[in-house]
Amino acid sequence: MAVTACQGLGFVVSLIGIAGIIAATCMDQWSTQDLYNNPVTAVFNYQGLWRSCVRESSGFTECRGYFTLLGLPAMLQAVRALMIVGIVLGAIGLLVSIFALKCIRIGSMEDSAKANMTLTSGIMFIVSGLCAIAGVSVFANMLVTNFWMSTANMYTGMGGMVQTVQTRYTFGAALFVGWVAGGLTLIGGVMMCIACRGLAPEETNYKAVSYHASGHSVAYKPGGFKASTGFGSNTKNKKIYDGGARTEDEVQSYPSKHDYV
């Protein structure tokens, strides 16, 4: 039950995170005009990964796409790439995790396959979250660098006489959405990996302890009976589901391929 809950929660958290990453990537407010100590402009500027927008005092807003690929800063291209990779990995992870969910039955899919898929989706979510966090952080660093450069030189001279307004930009809403969404996707991925450990079938070589009670023998294995059909049915090397609880014996059992998580 705990595994199902962990897996389900991991999926939901990741889903929210990836939706957030998509939203952040599409948002126009990656950087917004800094209004503090700036020349007071009658227009408000904000920029995204794909276009820049200007809101006039009337509220009329006009956006222009970056209709160039080669003319854009390499850092912006890198941020775009990181966000897109994050979205793609997250989307694939979501697809995989849907089939991995314990509450969804697809044919006669074994728990081992579900465990594999849960781990795969978990890793994908973790990488997706890291991509988003990295992308947003790179952009934020770019903003901070540019902010202090333009603060040092609020007006750039043109031809010695004419001045152009040096607009300073600060963190936009998309950065915070991106950080939170990346974090959620990362947490969701970790939860999926934790759930995978619970789903993982254990190749356990149990030593049966024999108790003599009223003339007939009953093999008893503490902790291992949860998924068994009877008290005496787990004396052989059978695959059992232990719901995440681990006994001292199990800790010393042969390592499963899922135990490295």
């Epitope: 020349p39 007071v40 402009t41 009658a42 227009v43 500027n45 904000y46 920029q47 820049s52 927008c53 200007v54 006039e56 005092s57 009337s58 509220g59 009329f60 006009e62 956006c63 222009r64 007006y155 043109m158 004419v162 001045q163 152009t164 307004v165």
Partner: antibody, heavy 119, light 113 residues
């Protein structure tokens, strides 16, 4: 039809105060920013003040900062300019102007009200 | 503050003639975010309030005759009347609508010879 009608102008002594009003009709007043622009007799135009539709942004010309206060009452469709510590150089025709939807332009102007500061 | 300088101060032309007047700002009025120039032109006829002619440096206000056109970018702007009519006698003002305070040029007076 958009109409802006200024009132409250007149003769005032230096150091005195005056409150100009602008009654508007023909458009949704609460959706538009408003300006005050003045024109001294025989001179050019001088922008005085701006107030945004929701009064969040208010800006003044350096020459009137600290002396003039712009305000609005969206319920009454009215714009106001409170002028204190008036000087001779404040003598002008004061126009109430609507801020246009595009390009921050000043698209509709009232006929103006004359303020004369003289002893 | 942005200083707007118009030239010439006045000009007298014959009817049907083409006329151009200039406006220069001390700072660029170009907004890279939307590729717009925040400069506006007004016409003020004697005894009347000003009337909006052109915004965004080159966009004609609705109802303005197409003989009026605006051009320029950054700091240098021009208002052109392709064929002057008698009713065009007025003072023409340019205005910075980019940075507060929103400054006007001193005006260019157009007269008919």
């Amino acid at each position: 039809e958009v109409q802006l009608v200024e009132s409250g102008g007149g003769l005032v002594q230096p150091g005195g105060s005056l409150r100009l009003s602008c009654a508007v009709s023909g458009f949704t007043f609460s959706s538009f920013g408003m300006h005050w622009v003045r024109q001294a007799p025989g001179k050019g135009l001088e922008w005085v003040a701006y107030i945004s539709s929701g009064t969040t942004n208010i800006y003044y010309a350096d020459s009137v900062k600290g002396r003039f206060t712009v305000s609005r009452d969206n319920a009454k469709n009215s714009l106001y300019l409170q002028m204190n510590s008036l000087r001779a150089e404040d003598t002008a025709v004061y126009y109430c102007v609507r801020s246009g939807y595009y390009g921050n332009s000043l698209d509709y102007w009232g006929q103006g009200t004359l303020v004369t500061v003289s002893s | 503050d942005i200083v707007m300088t118009q030239s010439p101060d006045s000009l007298a032309v014959s009817l049907g003639e083409r006329v151009t007047m200039n406006c220069k700002s001390s700072q660029s009025l170009f907004q890279s975010g939307n590729q717009r120039n925040y400069l506006t032109w007004y016409q003020q006829k004697p005894g009347q309030p000003p009337k909006l002619l052109i915004y965004w440096a080159s966009t004609r206000e609705s109802g303005v005759p197409d003989r009026f056109s605006g051009s320029g970018s950054g700091t240098d702007f021009t208002l052109t009347i392709s064929s002057v009519q008698a009713e065009d006698v007025a003072v023409y003002y340019c205005q910075n609508v980019y940075i507060y305070p929103l400054t006007f040029g001193q005006g260019t007076k157009l007269e008919i010879k």
